[in-house]
Each structure stands twice: as structure tokens, then as C-alpha cells.
């Protein structure tokens, strides 16, 4: 019998600082370019190898960024939410929120879930 | 981290067709822009199609324009190399190859052009 997937949501302030290739990830979303139904907002669609959030480790690809400096990412257009990181200035923090999957055992075995994700 | 499964390669007579399909599990699938290269025997691996995470923008190797078209299905998180017309210089292992798509928060100009991130272990093509 499968078990029933679930999430754990999470968020973090992450302060990261600019490094010679900048912050170093990618992003989707936006009132825009919706990359989740119903929801607009700022997700991480890539982490680059070597580059400040890489070497910083915090942030993954999936994440859904709230915040850039106490800004809130909601209702932007797509290259608003771009342009306001690239003027985020030397040092960045961002708020953002972690979702990871847990799989639960079958009904019956609560508490053997192992989180994966 | 993401897994890539390629499949449909094998040995086809010049002027055959063959389709290559690629399987990506690990993340959504939805969100990644995908390509194809291929390594030629004692060649470098080159660039031979990519299509971006949303499906509206497609790049081809000048020498199989008008003979291969990459497309993809979100639906079964699967990336499609179809190949006509095939040519004995099209033999080659074929890879497939994922990144995270989307727009850089640094620069226009920062990602690589053909730069990816994750790679499948690739299938053979031999055109006779």
C-alpha cells in the first residue's frame, strides 16, 4: 500500500552577497508567466554551479522566494521580479519558502514517514 | 537533482527515421529546459536541438534543420527527438540534457547558450 505524499513548508531568511557572477540562480513565475496554477509568485527554477547561492547552500531550486530586501515579490509582472533582483544591490536577503515532500507510510504506520525530497 | 533516461536509439538504414525519447524524474519537469547533443566517433560532443521550459523557443544544429524536431510533454515529463531522413554522419550516442529555465536574476547575457546542468547517459545511433 503506497503511502499518502505530504508537505512540510518551511521558510528561511537567507542573506546572500553578490559574487563576481552575481547571485547565481534563475527564476519563473509571475502575474505573467504563472508557473504554478493560481499562483503568481517567484519561484527558483535554477541553482548555477560555483555561484553565491550555490556556494551558500541554502537556497534550491523549487524554493518560492516572499521577499528581497523586506520587498514583497507578490503581484509582480515576471522581469519586475527580475529587475528587482538585479538592483538588489551588493548584499541580498531573501525570504523564502521551503516545501519539502514527505512520504507518509500507509494508514496504520503514522510517524515512519521519511522525508524526501 | 535530476535523473534523464534516454531511449530509442539503435541501427537504422540511411534515409530511415528513428525517434529518440527522453524520461526526466527528480523535479518538475515543467520548469526545465531540455536539449539534445550528440557525440560523433573521435568528435566533441555538439549541440543538436533544445527547446526552452515553456516550449516556444527551439534551436537546431544547421545540418538537421527541416530533418529533426525536438518537442516536448509535460504531461508525461518526456522530451522527444524525432529524426528523418537520417544521414550516415547522424551516427553518433545521443544525450539528453536538462537545466533549470527561466530568467537569470544577473544578466541577460549570463547563461551559457548551451550550458546544462544534468545529463542522461545516452543511446546509440548508427545509421548504415
Known amino acids: 500500500m503506497n503511502g499518502r505524499v505530504d508537505y512540510l513548508v518551511t521558510e528561511e531568511e537567507i542573506n546572500l552577497t553578490r559574487g563576481p557572477s552575481g547571485l547565481g540562480f534563475n527564476i519563473v513565475g509571475g502575474t505573467d508567466q504563472q508557473y504554478v496554477s493560481n499562483d503568481s509568485g517567484i519561484y527558483v527554477s535554477r541553482i548555477k554551479e560555483n555561484g553565491a547561492a550555490a556556494l551558500d547552500g541554502r537556497l534550491q531550486e523549487g524554493d518560492k522566494i516572499l521577499s528581497v530586501n523586506g520587498q514583497d515579490l507578490k503581484n509582480l509582472l515576471h522581469q519586475d521580479a527580475v529587475d528587482l533582483f538585479r538592483n538588489a544591490g551588493y548584499a541580498v536577503s531573501l525570504r523564502v519558502q521551503h516545501r519539502l515532500q514527505v512520504q507518509n507510510g500507509p494508514i496504520g504506520h503514522r510517524g515512519e514517514g521519511d522525508p524526501s525530497g | 537533482e535530476v535523473q534523464l533516461v534516454e531511449s530509442g536509439g539503435g541501427l537504422v538504414q540511411a534515409g530511415g527515421s528513428l525517434r529518440l525519447s527522453c524520461a526526466a524524474s527528480?523535479?518538475?519537469?515543467?520548469?526545465?529546459?531540455m536539449g539534445w547533443f550528440r557525440q560523433r566517433p573521435g568528435k566533441e560532443r555538439d549541440v543538436v536541438a533544445t527547446?526552452?521550459?515553456?516550449?516556444?523557443?527551439?534551436y537546431y544544429l544547421d545540418s538537421v534543420k527541416g530533418r529533426f524536431t525536438i518537442s516536448r510533454d509535460n504531461a508525461k515529463n518526456t522530451v522527444f527527438l524525432q529524426m528523418n531522413s537520417l544521414k550516415p554522419e547522424d551516427t553518433a550516442v545521443y544525450y539528453c540534457?536538462?537545466?533549470?529555465?527561466?530568467?537569470?536574476?544577473?544578466?541577460?547575457?549570463?547563461?551559457?547558450?548551451?550550458?546544462?546542468?544534468?545529463w542522461g547517459q545516452g543511446t546509440q545511433v548508427t545509421v548504415s
Open positions: 540534457a536538462a537545466r533549470g529555465g527561466g530568467s537569470s536574476v544577473d544578466s541577460e547575457y549570463d547563461d551559457g547558450e548551451f550550458e546544462y546542468d544534468y
Open positions: 527528480g523535479r518538475p519537469f515543467s520548469s526545465l529546459d
Open positions: 527547446i526552452n521550459w515553456t516550449g516556444d523557443s527551439t
